[in-house]
């Protein structure tokens, strides 16, 4: 070809290319400029889809080579572009030009039945020519070029059933056919290309033709009397045997139900099983063999779909009779109970007796049943059977706090078959015998300071028992009888703990270093046991603010959560209280009315100072000022934020005398009326009375400051809302409640 | 490391054809310009022609008539055949490797061959 | 066809010398397509320079190249003793490729 383009242009031969060209590297033909008569050096590029990797060009020469197998039904053409540039002057010195390499075709493709194998389905005994199927095939060469990918169908097996048409592929049936005969034919299509002329290619497909299923068919039993066995010990619902009544049809066309038609006794039924079709004899009432022997019964079998064009074929049904011996049967002894439960109190004698097992044979009311315990190698044998009449025993005394529950297995064996064995569970509860003394529940460090003042309180103590904790179980505290010590007392707290106490002063290192109280703890058991338990006292050095100088120093300050600086500024509140004090004191006499009821016995010996005068929005949202409107103070349950506020203890002597109510109550009522007045005064919400001390409390009370012995008024039901965690607390204040109440 | 390995008889008779064959080891024959090149003794070196991997041939016009150069790529192998041969074409042949990379212009050859003479008499 | 000459037809100097080798083209050799090559005796020619300029890969320093047109020139600024061997030059901007006579750079 010639691409003439003003004087100028390319000169190029081949652009057809055979497809399927077996060598590496197949030369398609030579792009030339008609510029390129020798005396230049052009270089030839090729660009475009396929150029540089299924086409190359040698630049030098212009000579285009396909280096990959080509394959028209993959691609048949490509467009490319061609350039020439002067080596010279690096320049292009023609326009780009286009051009087209094309895929020739060549009969290289068989036919293809895409989708073969084929399976088709035709009812049974349809029509002659009916349609079945059609099948398709494809060629993957050129079909608008000659005959590479013309098809012709013929039937290569399948005669005389069926036949297809040569150009279109549809395969029909050409003679009635029955399923129960034959429910399958193999048909095999041939597709030839080249309109079958010689060279052409041809493909096979097998079509798999499935004749389905119509009802044409009745059920059918196979015998006129079947025999069947029953256990006399089989249980109602117990499936007796299976009958089949055979239907050459299938699926829903071979469905059928069964009915027992005759069967006055009403002791079998039948159900039909959806998926096998069989009928399931069941036993609807518990047979005996001494009563009857033998029992018959007339079972009929009928299809359940009929189809209306082949009602010429029916009755679809069948019966048969079905005879059913009682067998005899020996049963393994019975129980009276599938389990037992029995108790025992704990620590009783080898040989006590803990229950009896029972069991018969039905069989045979005079066979005897001996008894066994199914003994695991791994326990040790606690329990013994008497073998004739089941009672059982212990081995040796048991221990509740070892195992308060044993678990064995008991027999009973035939004594004439020994093979027919039964079994049955015991429970053995093993009950509580109060066997424990009770006991401190810790090791307790104690210490006195030599200056301590007598009704100190200087140790909680509480117990712990192994007997079983009901909830009744209480424990009660004394100083044991042997020692005549004038040092301490023990105060019963009457709930499971004590406090001791010191009971006089004077308490001197020198002369005693150690004090040994002998505790004694009683439960409430029965009988009721006791144990006496040492406290270890240590007298300590202390100074006059009743801290300790050694015996720990660190612990003990540990122990009341003091560090040493706070100990200092804790001291120097403690001057300015004095002084406050000391003028409450002065003042006391003027005024008698009480806000507050007034108990002395109630007043603490720890001082609390609570710096959290005035908090602006934190304390709005904390306190209610109408509470300091009413006479009497409630305790209302308002959310707080979270405020650290420091909180400074130590401890002092107690003051044994409480301060004049009437005093605070002016000093109130001045406050209260400077706030309401004075708009610029912030609400004066930072009076906080502790006049209510939680009397259930083990740790005692917060303040030095005289309590209110009532607290009657409050209500505690909130502390239940609070979780698990506060459980404990919420039983005690709530319980306190209700027991005043 | 590419390495030219040409082979062949060293004696060729008269109008006979002479046939090497180079040998390249070391990487491919694919991408490449290979060329055959020739130097009759004491004299200077002539270029006889190249082929490139996909086939492409291009050969000296002086001796065009006479030579066919083809590429085995299975055996990364290239040939010479030079027909026709006189005593002037006693000389020591090279194969050679074009340093341009893939199809472009011509390149100076960067890998040679160690040689092999090839004597024309009878 | 392009015929290159290359002069002298044998150079002597003595080591540390510089060399300068010349080689003229019939015609313009089109994109300074020019290469110098080395062969010592017994050996294949080794590529020092292409593209009129560029050094081949491990050719040391000492050897350039320069020209364009006609006009191409190789210097060794300073000999080596392993550089006495003939140098020849060779075109490749137009087919058929062809090379110079040679120079021979012998030990003075």
């Known amino acids: 070809d010639y691409k003439d383009d003003d004087d100028k242009g390319w000169v190029w031969n081949q652009f057809f290319v055979p497809e399927e060209m077996n060598t590496t590297s197949h030369h398609i033909g030579q792009l030339r400029s008609d510029l390129d008569n020798g005396n230049n050096s052009f270089q030839y590029k090729l660009l475009g889809a396929g150029a540089g990797s299924t086409f190359i060009i040698d630049e030098r020469t212009g000579d285009i080579y396909a280096i990959q197998k080509l394959d028209r039904e993959e691609r048949s053409l490509y467009i490319l572009r061609a350039q020439v540039i002067d080596i010279a002057t690096g320049r292009a010195v023609e326009p780009e030009s286009e051009f087209v390499i094309k895929v020739s075709d060549i009969n290289d493709h068989e036919p293809q039945f895409l989708d073969g194998p084929y399976v088709a389905t035709v009812p049974e005994m349809s029509p002659e020519g009916t349609s079945v199927t059609q099948v398709t095939a494809t060629d993957g060469d050129d079909p608008s070029y000659g005959n590479n990918a013309r098809l012709l169908y013929s039937l290569i097996q399948g005669q005389p059933y069926f036949s297809v048409e040569p150009k279109t592929g549809v395969i029909r049936m050409t003679s009635q056919m029955d399923r129960e005969t034959k429910d399958q034919y193999l048909v095999v299509i041939q597709a030839k290309d080249m309109v079958g002329q010689a060279g052409a290619f041809s493909a096979t497909a097998t079509v798999t033709i499935n004749l389905s299923d119509v009802n044409d068919n009745p059920p059918k039993f196979q015998q006129r009397l079947y025999y069947l066995n029953v256990s006399e010990e089989a249980p109602v619902g117990t499936t007796v045997g299976r009958l089949l009544a055979e239907d050459s049809d299938i699926g829903e066309n071979a469905a059928m139900n069964y009915f027992i038609e005759e069967d006055s006794s009403d002791v079998f039924g039948i159900i039909t099983d959806r998926e096998t079709q069989e009928g399931i004899i069941i036993l609807k009432k518990r047979v005996d063999y001494e009563s009857k022997r033998k029992h018959s019964v007339r079972v009929k079998a009928v299809n359940r779909y009929i189809d209306d064009r082949f009602l010429k074929e029916g009755p679809f049904e069948d019966i048969t009779i079905v005879q059913i011996s009682v067998v005899d049967a020996d049963e393994p002894p019975v129980f009276t109970l599938e389990s037992y439960v029995m108790e025992i109190a704990e620590g009783v004698v080898s040989g006590s007796l803990v229950g009896t097992v029972s069991a018969r044979d039905l069989d045979n009311d005079d066979s005897s049943v001996r008894y066994s315990i199914v003994q695991g190698l791994h326990l040790k044998r606690l329990f013994s059977i008497n073998e004739h009449n089941g009672t059982i025993i212990t081995t040796e005394p048991l221990d509740r706090e070892k195992a308060s529950w044993h678990n064995i297995t008991v027999t009973a064996t035939e004594t004439r078959n020994p093979e027919k064995i039964s079994e049955a569970n015991v429970y053995i509860q093993v009950l509580d015998v109060n066997d424990h003394a009770p006991e401190f529940s810790k090791y307790y460090e104690t210490f006195v300071c030599e200056n301590a003042v007598p009704g100190q309180l200087i140790q909680n103590i509480s117990a712990v028992d192994k007997d079983d904790s009901a909830e009744n179980h209480r424990f009660y505290f004394s100083l044991a009888q042997a020692t005549n010590s004038s040092h301490f007392t023990v105060k019963d707290n009457q709930d499971n703990t004590a406090g001791i106490f010191t009971a006089g002063s004077g308490f001197s290192r020198k002369e005693q270093f150690y004090f040994f109280l002998p505790i004694l703890i009683l439960d409430n058991g029965s009988p009721p046991l006791t144990s006496t338990n040492t406290l270890t006292v240590t007298v300590c050095d202390c100074d006059t603010e009743v801290n300790t100088l050694y015996c720990r120093y660190g612990a003990f300050l540990y122990s009341i959560g003091l560090s040493t600086e706070a100990l200092v500024a804790v001291l120097a509140c403690l001057l300015i209280l004095l002084v406050f004090f000391l003028a409450i004191i002065g003042i006391r006499q003027q005024r008698k009315k009480t806000l507050f009821s007034e108990k002395v016995e109630e007043f603490r010996e720890n001082i609390v100072r609570y710096d959290d005068e005035g908090g602006g929005e934190e304390d709005t949202e904390a306190f209610d000022i109408s509470a300091l409107r009413t006479r009497a103070v409630l305790r209302t349950h308002k959310p707080r934020k979270k405020i650290t506020t420091e909180i400074h203890s130590l401890y002092r002597q107690s003051l044994q005398v409480g301060p004049d109510s009437a005093i605070f109550r002016q000093f109130i009522s001045e406050k209260l009326e400077e706030a309401n007045t004075d708009p610029s005064v912030p609400p004066y919400d930072s009076l906080q009375t502790y006049a209510f001390e939680g009397t259930g409390s083990l740790a005692g009370s917060l303040s030095s400051l005289g309590s209110n012995t009532s607290d009657v008024d409050q209500n505690y039901e909130y502390l239940v809302g609070w979780g698990p965690p506060f459980k404990q607390l919420a039983g005690m204040y709530t319980s306190q409640r209700s027991t005043r109440d | 490391q590419v390495q030219l390995q040409e082979s062949g008889p060293g004696l060729v008779k008269p109008s006979e054809t002479l046939s090497l064959t180079c040998t390249v080891s070391?990487?491919?024959?694919?991408?490449?310009?290979w060329s055959w090149i020739r130097q009759p003794p004491g004299k200077g070196l002539e270029w006889i022609g190249y082929?490139?991997?996909?086939?492409?041939?291009n050969y000296n016009p002086s001796l065009k008539s006479r030579v066919t150069i083809s590429v085995d790529t299975s055996k990364n192998q290239f040939s010479l055949k030079l027909s026709s041969v006189t005593a002037a074409d006693t000389a020591l042949y090279y194969c050679?490797?074009?340093?341009?990379?893939?199809?472009?212009?011509?390149?100076?050859?960067?890998?040679w061959g160690q040689g092999t003479m090839v004597t024309v008499s009878s | 066809d392009i015929v290159l000459t290359q002069s002298p037809g044998t150079l002597s100097l003595s080591p540390g010398e510089r060399a300068t080798l010349s080689c003229r083209a019939s015609?313009?050799?089109?994109?300074?397509?020019l290469a110098w090559y080395q062969q010592k005796p017994g050996q294949a020619p080794r590529l020092l320079i292409s593209g009129a300029s560029s050094r081949a890969t491990g050719i040391p320093d000492r050897f350039s190249g320069s020209g364009s047109g006609t006009d191409f020139t190789l210097t060794i600024s300073r000999l080596e003793p392993e550089d006495f061997a003939v140098y020849y030059c060779?075109?490749?901007?137009?087919?058929?490729?062809?090379f110079g006579q040679g120079t021979r750079l012998e030990m003075k």
């Open positions: 050679a490797r074009d340093s341009r990379y893939r199809s472009g212009w011509y390149d100076a050859f960067d890998i």
């Open positions: 015609q313009s050799v089109a994109g300074s397509y």
């Open positions: 082929i490139y991997y996909i086939g492409s041939t």
């Open positions: 070391g990487g491919s024959i694919n991408s490449y310009y």
């Open positions: 060779q075109q490749y901007g137009k087919s058929p490729i062809t």
